[in-house]
Structures are given as structure tokens and as C-alpha cells.
Interface confidence: medium
């Protein structure tokens, strides 16, 4: 196809390559999340870090374990979503199950869609393992009604 992306050199499976951004990632593709009047789209992201163990330290934001993991994850997301539309992340939560990470990503409206959020995150998994020693699996992305509006969107995950 005529347009390619430097960060998207090969296809592996659809879960890591769906709907790669069409113009360069400065204006990527699709968000089902409702938008605020300020023009922000939100996505809920969940993934497992299978090489870490959950313990009570991850329930206490003052612990070193919590803060180091939060810092690594925050830094990782700044690396993954370098394009101008990424506004940041919030509401990081850690859950049992190795370590399950849940967080909310914010993007400028119209700059990315849920599939590209997932695509770019999946494509970073290898680098996450080498750079941060985080083995990531079970990635799930969905649109979020924020701030907690009634209905997210009409895309029904199976």
C-alpha cells in the first residue's frame, strides 16, 4: 500500500496492527470515546505485567514499588504515544493477577482511535521488555465515557 509508517514495519497479527494510522501518527485514526467540550478523547487501557507479582505495596502510592512502577509506566506511555495528540494518562491502578495495570489515556480529539491506541501499545511490547523489564500481555483498550457520561459508544466488544 502507498502509505507506510516507520514504526509499523511489519505485520504480525491483527491485534497488533489493526487500522494503522493513515496519515503519519500526528493525526492518527479512530476514537469511539465521547468527547468533552475541550476536545479530549479518553481510552481505558488494561494490561498484565506477567513477570511481576502483585503485593500490598501496589495498594499504597507511597511505597517505592508503587512509585517506581508508576514512573516506568508513565515514561513508557510517553515513549509509545509520542505524537502531538497525546495529552497524558491518569488513574493508574494496580490489581492482583501477576500485576494488572489499569489506566486512562487522554488524547486530543480526532487524533487517534481505539484500534490505534491498541496497535501502538502492542508494537511497543518488545521494547517494554528490554527497556523496562516489563513483560506485557492481555492488552485491552476501550473507549470511556468521561467524565462518566451515561453511554460510551455503540461499539460492542465481543
Amino acid at each position: 500500500t502507498p502509505t507506510t509508517l516507520a514504526s509499523h514495519s511489519t505485520k504480525t497479527d491483527a491485534s497488533s496492527t489493526h487500522h494503522s494510522s493513515v496519515p503519519p501518527l500526528t493525526s492518527s485514526n479512530h476514537s469511539t470515546s465521547p468527547q468533552l467540550s475541550t476536545g479530549v478523547s479518553f481510552f481505558f487501557l488494561s494490561f498484565h505485567i506477567s513477570n511481576l507479582q502483585f503485593n500490598s505495596s501496589l495498594e499504597d502510592p507511597s511505597t517505592d514499588y508503587y512509585q517506581e512502577l508508576q514512573r516506568d509506566i508513565s515514561e513508557m506511555f510517553l515513549q509509545i504515544y509520542k505524537q502531538g495528540g497525546f495529552l497524558g494518562l491518569s488513574n493508574i491502578k494496580f490489581r492482583p493477577g501477576s500485576v494488572v495495570v489499569q489506566l486512562t489515556l487522554a488524547f486530543r480529539e480526532g487524533t487517534i482511535n481505539v484500534h490505534d491506541v491498541e496497535t501502538q501499545f502492542n508494537q511497543y511490547k518488545t521494547e517494554a521488555a528490554s527497556r523496562y523489564n516489563l513483560t506485557i500481555s492481555d492488552v485491552s483498550v476501550s473507549d470511556v465515557p468521561f467524565p462518566f457520561s451515561a453511554q460510551s459508544g455503540a461499539g460492542v466488544p465481543g
Epitope: 497479527d13 487500522h19 496519515p23 459508544g153 455503540a154 466488544p157
Partner: antibody, heavy 119, light 107 residues
């Protein structure tokens, strides 16, 4: 060259279920999400849903959530759509379509299966 | 659901004329708009993706433009073989939706 092969036509009775098939060739089946699109006679296009062949993950149009079930068979590079409780409203051409490399659109289309629901 | 509104519903043009089809989204869809051509008794074919990227093998007389809510497909010099229905579609927000189509007839 990517090809999506679909049966030309199916005739079923009201109230029955029908499974439509789509066989892919010419590309790595698991690399591209597969979509299904409905077109009633003389009408426009309606997206039913999509399935990720690599892990079976699906997204549905809410309007079809109770009507359609999407599945894939990685080994035969085939996608299927089961339609249930068929009525005359379901008479339409059903297309399978798939992504292309770095394309957020339906790059490849099957020829479509004409489903006729009639007693 | 995002509504894609196409205009005009139909048009009749002479060979060599410039054709402009428009598509308006009910919400911001970024550049996640594709254009499809469907000739009589055929499957749709992808012409333009990402609002302005011409798909492989599509003649360069077809040009897409626009972003956010307003999109245009232009055929710089229409040919007899361009007789078809043209649909825009968005892949920004679930469910993916299409416009109602524009029927292009050749005089």
C-alpha cells in the same frame, strides 16, 4: 493478490439461521481484521461488525449484536457470520471485507452473498 | 452513532467534467474517512483512505480532501467508466458508518 471468496446466493426460510462464509487467500489471514457489511437492495452500506482472526476478538454494531455472530477458522483462513431469527428485513447482500496494510478502510471486498429470506 | 451525510444524492455529468462529491460527518472524525466506488452489480472498491490517500491502483483523477467533519471526493475529469455509486465511510468511532451514497450518472 488478496481474494475473499463468498458463495453467490443463499435461500432460507423465515425464522431460520444461516451461516455465511468468506474464505481468504493471498495474504496472511491473521494479520487483517475481517469485517462484514450489509447492503439491502437499492440501499446503502451498513457495517455489521469485525473480528480479529488472530484472537477471535470482535466488535459489533449494536444494531446487529443479537442478529449476527462472527467467527473465524485460522486453519482454513475462513471467516463466518451466523445470522439468526431471519426475517425479510435480513434479505440483503452481505459482504466480507478486510483491512489492508496501513489502511483504515476496507481494502479488500468479497463478491458478496445474496441472502434471500422467503417462505 | 456518527452520521455521514452525502450530497448530492445523484448527479449527471458529461465526460471530461469535474465532479465534486461531499460528505459531512455529524462529529469530528479526524481524517478517518474513506471513499468507496460501487459499480452496478459489483462489490464496493476502496478509492481513498485517511481522507486524502489514494489507494493502490486508483487513477489519479480521484482526489480526496478534508478533515474533522467536512470531506470531499473530486474527480478531475470524469470518464464513462466512473458511472457508479460513491460512498464515504468513517472508521473513527464505533460503529463504523457509511454515508447514504451519491449516484453518479454519465450524460
Amino acid at each position: 493478490q488478496v481474494q475473499l471468496q463468498q458463495p453467490g446466493a443463499e435461500l432460507v426460510k423465515p425464522g431460520a439461521s444461516e451461516k455465511l462464509s468468506c474464505k481468504a487467500s493471498g495474504h496472511t489471514f491473521t494479520s487483517y481484521w475481517m469485517h462484514w457489511v450489509k447492503q439491502r437492495p437499492g440501499q446503502g452500506l451498513e457495517w455489521i461488525g469485525e473480528i480479529n482472526p488472530s484472537n477471535g476478538r470482535t466488535y459489533y454494531n449494536e444494531n446487529f449484536k443479537t442478529k449476527a455472530t462472527l467467527t473465524v477458522d485460522k486453519y482454513s483462513s475462513s471467516a463466518s457470520m451466523q445470522l439468526r431469527s431471519l426475517t425479510s428485513e435480513d434479505s440483503a447482500v452481505y459482504y466480507c471485507a478486510s483491512d489492508g496494510d496501513y489502511v483504515s478502510g476496507f481494502a479488500y471486498w468479497g463478491q458478496g452473498t445474496t441472502l434471500t429470506v422467503s417462505s | 452513532n456518527i452520521v455521514m451525510t452525502q450530497s448530492p444524492k445523484s448527479m449527471s455529468m458529461s465526460v471530461g467534467e469535474r465532479v465534486t462529491l461531499t460528505c459531512k460527518a455529524s462529529e469530528n472524525v479526524g481524517t478517518y474517512v474513506s471513499w468507496y466506488q460501487q459499480k452496478p452489480e459489483q462489490s464496493p472498491k476502496l478509492l481513498i483512505y485517511g481522507a486524502s490517500n489514494r489507494y493502490t491502483g486508483v487513477p489519479n483523477r480521484f482526489t480526496g480532501s478534508g478533515s474533522a467533519t467536512d470531506f470531499t471526493l473530486t474527480i478531475s475529469s470524469v470518464q464513462a467508466e466512473d458511472l457508479a455509486d460513491y460512498y464515504c465511510g468513517q472508521s473513527y468511532s464505533y460503529p463504523w458508518t457509511f454515508g447514504g451514497g451519491t449516484k453518479l450518472e454519465i450524460k
